[in-house]
Amino acid sequence: EEELQVIQPDKSISVAAGESATLHCTVTSLIPVGPIQWFRGAGPGRELIYNQKEGHFPRVTTVSDLTKRNNMDFSIRISNITPADAGTYYCVKFRKGSPDDVEFKSGAGTELSVRAKPSAPVVSGPAARATPQHTVSFTCESHGFSPRDITLKWFKNGNELSDFQTNVDPAGDSVSYSIHSTAKVVLTREDVHSQVICEVAHVTLQGDPLRGTANLSETIRVPPTLEVTQQPVRAENQVNVTCQVRKFYPQRLQLTWLENGNVSRTETASTLTENKDGTYNWMSWLLVNVSAHRDDVKLTCQVEHDGQPAVSKSHDLKVSAHPKEQGSNTAPGPALASAAPL
């Protein structure tokens, strides 16, 4: 009879994480008598996976009844495969002996690779808000995938971005891998409703990539533009001055009126109107009693937006006497002139 050969027909197999892996092994002879053992890896540091003779291997089941003398199929099935199970598995025939069994012949090995899905990409933006025209960085991370080959793309509102850098770690062989990418995005005033998307494609996803998103509303700060205007006279000796606060984001805003540098009123923005682009408008008005002033009045609308240093716009009221018009219930008030903003 020809000498026993150990046949592992599969040079490599690929299994999805969570599934079972069947490792095939047959022998060509029933002699010599002795057990089969399965190992992961070769050499002195090899890891015992299954021993026909003894031991408890809860994740391993045999395809055939290995207790029988006439069995020549020593295939095993390993359940609930994880990336940590990747490696080369050897089916090894031992000859019965003492004090230890003697290794007789090994199969050529079967390389088990584990297909593991990447985790859902997590996109994070800068810690602090930034204003339009500034460049901000977004990071995207995904972990636990195998094999190493992976594709990552960035999009802003559906348009692919090109300014990004991606690393897959570790560089060498590993049971699983992680990807880290940083993209640079230039903010515009219209970005309140914008989204940045990180898209990850991997063999395990069967053409249906994973996406992580970040809303630029969490990142952008659009500072307001201020316009102070004087309205027609409301009543005798009273002038209505409005401060239009336009196109700002986020909502958090506090407005202070100053008369000749003295605080007249402070209010927090409420009842905002939202623009199509996601920014907000707000208007505050101030009734100025002109008769209480002998000199010209400098009115200042001072706005503190989202904790940033205040911005302001001023308006000069010229105080001068005008004769009353006949039949008029309201005095025309002082002559008013708009001054250039400070």
Epitope: L30, R69, N70, D100
Partner: antibody
Framework: EVQLVESGGGLVQPGGSLRLSCAAS????????MHWVRQATGKGLEWVSV???????YYPGSVKGRFTISRENAKNSLYLQMNSLRVGDTAVYYC????????????WGQGTMVTVSS | DIQMTQSPSSLSASIGDKVTITCRAS??????LAWFQQKPGKAPKSLIY???SLQSGVPSKFSGSGSGTDFTLTISSLQPEDFATYYC?????????FGQGTKLEIK
């Protein structure tokens, strides 16, 4: 049903010969090592011989050169040719299958009695 | 040849008792040790192989342990059908050899 049935035992004079047979059924006979074991009345068990799957044979010193084990796979039969019999060979002879992966005996026949006496 | 020595040669026990029989090999036999049960006028019955593996159909009250040179057979709760003679056997190398037997009798 897996079964082993011995036959061929009997009374024989010292120096005589006897051929024991073991008929196997219920399994693939050719895939198993087969053994003969004997037991003298009131005594313990003694292993007598083995024939492997490939036809290789082994014997203890007590029977070497006198006993020959053989098999006929086509007939699912095991044999033990006993020559130059001695009074000390008197025993019940059992055939046994090395049925476990390690050749541990798992199935035994009911035995056949061999008496060597003048 | 490898010598196998069983102890005790005979043992008296009662129904429900737990009993242990030991077997010692004259040299290391790894764990290639089998245990057999034999009743008067009957063929031996295989109980255990590779020191601790139960043969198919053998009740779990029988258990074996050991490796190297020292081995034990334990019967956890004796029943009337368990009173018999028990043999150990090494089968690591030819010639296979048996212990002299332990006769388990009812007290």
């Amino acid at each position: 049903e897996v079964q082993l049935v011995e036959s061929g035992g009997g009374l024989v004079q010292p120096g005589g010969s006897l051929r024991l047979s073991c008929a196997a059924s219920g399994f693939t006979f050719s895939s198993y090592d087969m053994h003969w074991v004997r037991q003298a009345t009131g005594k313990g068990l003694e292993w007598v011989s083995v024939i492997g799957i490939a036809g290789d044979t082994y014997y203890p010193g007590s029977v070497k050169g006198r006993f020959t084990i053989s098999r006929e796979n086509a007939k699912n039969s095991l044999y033990l040719q006993m020559n130059s019999l001695r009074v000390g060979d008197t025993a019940v002879y059992y055939c046994a299958r090395g049925g476990s992966w390690d050749d541990a005996f798992d199935i035994w026949g009911q035995g056949t009695m061999v008496t060597v006496s003048s | 040849d490898i010598q196998m020595t069983q102890s005790p040669s005979s043992l008296s026990a009662s129904i429900g008792d737990k009993v242990t029989i030991t077997c010692r090999a004259s040299q290391d036999i790894n764990n290639y040790l089998a245990w057999f049960q034999q009743k008067p006028g009957k063929a031996p019955k295989s109980l255990i192989y590779t020191a601790s593996s139960l043969q198919s159909g053998v009740p779990s009250k029988f258990s074996g342990s050991g490796s190297g040179t020292d081995f034990t057979l334990t019967i956890s709760s004796l029943q009337p059908e368990d009173f018999a003679t028990y043999y150990c056997q090494q089968y690591v190398s030819y010639p296979y050899t048996f212990g002299q037997g332990t006769k388990l009798e009812i007290k």
